[in-house]
Every structure is written in C-alpha cells, then in structure tokens.
C-alpha cells in the first residue's frame, strides 16, 4: 500500500498509524479504530473514517430540487460496523441493540428496529447532491469558471473520475454539485462518490482528512469561494423504507 516512504505517513488519511513493517520494510498504514490496512494512494472509505473519528479523543431555476426519496444525514456521527473491504455493513446496531439499515454512504434508510431487523443487501447510493451556499463576493461567480474549478477539484484532490461529476448548477449564492455513479459504472480502482463527497464535506468544514496538506483554499479566477452552509442529499438505487409516521 502506497505511503510516504521517507517519514512513513499516509498522504490521504491522517487518521492512521503508520510503521515500516510492510513487505520489505515498506511503510504500512492502518486506520485508527478498526486497525485495517489502508491504501494511501487513494481515499479511505467513509466507513473506516467514521470509525476512526469515533475512536479519536473527543474534543428559471436551474437548481435541482431533491427527490422525495432523497436522504439527508440527520443522525450524524455513530461508530459503524465495516466489512473486510471497509464498506458499511448493511445493518448497523448501537450498544443498546437498536438496529437500522444503511446505504453505501452509511446513512440510515429504514426506521430503527431491534436485533431481529433484517437488511438483505447494502443498497448503493448512486446520486449525491451537494448543496452549498457561499459567502458574499464582489459579484456572482462566472458559472463556467465555477464549474471548471469544482470539476478540477474533484478530479485532482479527490481523484474522482470526471464522468462521475454529472453537473454543477449555480444560482447565486447557491451552488449544487451532482455526483452520479451506478454500480455498473464503478470499475475497480474508481473512487466512490460517497467517499469523495465525505472528503469534500470535511474539507469544506475545515477538517481536512489529508495528511499535512493545508486546508482547502477554493478559488475561482483568484477569488476565494467561501462556503457558509452545506447540505448533502443522498439518492439510493432502491428508495428508502420509512414508515409514514416519520414523514409527518
């Protein structure tokens, strides 16, 4: 697994413990919390990052209207169960035996139940809508410049293939980034849109997950793009199953 050889660190995940105990004395990094080996040449899965975070010491409108089936992560942080590949297990339970089903980005998609709750498969989140509001600027950003800069960011910083950035919408002061990635489209080695969105979310909040890199300094033709509010909507390949009680 690629890691910085000289001082043995993980460039893509600072929530790791690294040591030169890999094959041939190579640097090997393990995620905090799970102890799982991570590939430092790419993004670490959101599940392992959440687990590491929980183990750390506590301190005409062009905009898209999210579908009625879109999920927002209202439950916040929890200590997830990850499978051997670092993906979320379909069923998550807490210490009091309350269980629920999640999608591939770890967001709850069913009502909470008990240990008898069945989650037959991990449902893939194939469409993510990132909704941002930026701080005042001297004028509106040029849409095409903004589009190009955000696509460049996802390609270069998060290593997300450009084909997965479906669209960038802008209606001052709201920016929307649409990420789309079906199961059939995702090839081996492709960064998952859920992981890219999570890294972006943490960057925007000033909580970069990258080792030693400065915070995100987003600029459009030299002008800073400063985000003051972020909302992320998740759409699954199979609509979520909530009781009507939750919807009222």
């Amino acid at each position: 697994h690629t890691a910085a050889q000289d001082n043995c660190t993980c460039p893509t995940n600072k929530m790791t413990v690294c040591s030169p105990d890999g094959p041939g004395g190579r640097c090997q990094c393990r995620a905090l919390g799970s102890g799982m080996a991570v590939d430092c040449s790419t993004l670490t899965s959101k599940c392992l990052l959440l687990k590491a975070r929980m183990s750390a010491p506590k301190n005409a409108r062009t905009l898209v209207r999210p579908s009625e089936h879109a999920l927002v992560d209202n439950d916040g942080l929890y200590d997830p169960d990850c499978d051997p590949e670092g993906r979320f297990k379909a069923r998550q339970c807490n210490q009091t035996s309350v269980c629920w089903c999640v999608n591939s980005v770890g967001v709850r998609r069913t009502d909470k139940g008990d240990l008898s709750l069945r989650c037959d498969e991990l449902v893939r989140t194939h469409h993510i809508l990132i909704d941002l509001r930026h701080r005042p600027t001297a004028g509106a950003f040029n849409h095409s410049d903004l589009d190009a800069e955000l696509r460049r960011l996802f390609r270069e910083r998060y290593r997300l293939h450009p084909k997965f950035v479906a669209a960038v919408h802008y209606e001052q002061p709201t920016i929307q980034i649409e990420l789309r990635q079906n199961t059939s489209q995702k090839a081996a080695g492709d960064v998952d849109i859920g992981d890219a969105a999570y890294y972006f979310e943490r960057d925007i909040k000033g909580e970069s997950l990258f080792q030693g890199r400065g915070g995100l300094d987003l600029r459009v033709r030299g002008e800073p793009l400063q985000v003051e509010r972020t909302l992320i909507y998740y759409l699954d390949e199979i609509p979520p199953k909530f009781s009507m009680k939750r919807l009222t």
Epitope: P136, T137, A138, G139, R219, G222, E223, P224, Q226
Partner: antibody, heavy 123, light 109 residues
Amino acid sequence: AVTLDESGGGLQTPGGALSLVCKGSGFTFSSYAMGWVRQAPGKGLEYVAAISSGSSTGYGAAVKGRATISKDTGQSTVRLQLNNLRAEDTATYYCAKSGYGGSASYVSDIDAWGHGTEVIVSS
Amino acid sequence: ALALTQPSSVSANPGETVEITCSGGGDYYGTYYYGWYQQKAPGSAPVTVIYDNTKRPSNIPSRFSGSTSGSTNTLTITGVQADDEAVYYCGSYDSSAGIFGAGTTLTVL
C-alpha cells in the same frame, strides 16, 4: 500576533495626492482581504476601500474615482492612493484585516486593526 | 445607500447585562452580516469584539457575544465591567462597499 503598521500620513495639500502603506505580519497575508477605514475628527468610522485575496476591489462613495487600493503580496503590504485631496479627507486612516478572503462583506468581517496614521489636508 | 441604526447611548451598572442593537444592514440573499468594533477614545485604534455576526477574536473576553434575529444584530455584554466603557460601532455589508453605524456610547455607572 497579527500586527498592521500604517505609514505615509502627515500634512497634505488640497488637490494633491496621498499614498498610505500598511504592512501586515503574523498571518498569511495572501489569504485575507485587507482594507482602509478612516475617522474624521469628532466623527464616526467610514469605509474607504478594500481589496480581496483575489484582488477584487471596493470603494466607499466619498472616495470613488479618486482612490486606488492595491497590494504587494510578496511584501505583505496594501497601499491606498488617494488623489485630488480635499479638506474633508482629513482623518485618521486605519488599516484593517478581514477574517476572510472575500471583499464584498468586508466591514462586517474585520478582525484586526492597525494603530492608524493621521492625515491632515490643509493649505 | 443603506444606513445602519444603533442607539446613540446606553448605560449600565457593573455586573449587569447590556444589549446594543444594530439594524439596516445589507441583505445578501436572506442573510445579514454584522461586526462590532470598540473604540475607547477618539483617535485610538478600534478593537474588534465581534465579527461575522457571532465570531469573537481570541483576545476578546467571552462576556462579549453577538446574535442575529432577522435583519437585526445584537451585541451582548454579560457582566459589564468599567473597562468596557467605550463607543461601539456596528459595521455591515452593503453590496461591494461597507457601512458603519454612527456608534453607541456605553457608560458604566
């Protein structure tokens, strides 16, 4: 600690030109908007000009067309050039730093001030 | 051009809570932005006590706080001290320029 040091004030003649310089230290100069605020004797604070980290500029109504704000990131300095001076430009001029890079909401974002330099326009 | 409205003076006894309001700032798509600046004597450098509505510089005591309700921002000084006696200016966003209020003189009795 953040420090802002102004220079260039003093006695000026009406119709002449003024050049004020502010040198910043203790912060990453290139990342923040900078600006000038003045206070005439016995009066309140007045916005003069600001420049964002990306070099977009804004000017107060009283100096628009007569003022130019610029910066030298390498030297960590911001300069205010004010032409066609009038008696009403007499004031203490303060250099101010924004807590952000953008310029449009500049006044509400000021998080640090210089000690000021006094400018007197008189014949 | 916009004009900020703030009271010309307020007074309080030491230990009391003081609130100074400021309204009339620019509306940036439904959001209003304000800052508060303390000046202890004319010609002395202002000191930022609150910027960006609620943010407090690290050198400012926690008794200073800012809050926004609609288009009005309120500077609250909890447990006012004699050293807080000063003129407080509010500042706000106005398109590509900035504006200040006329100042509120705080007298600590």
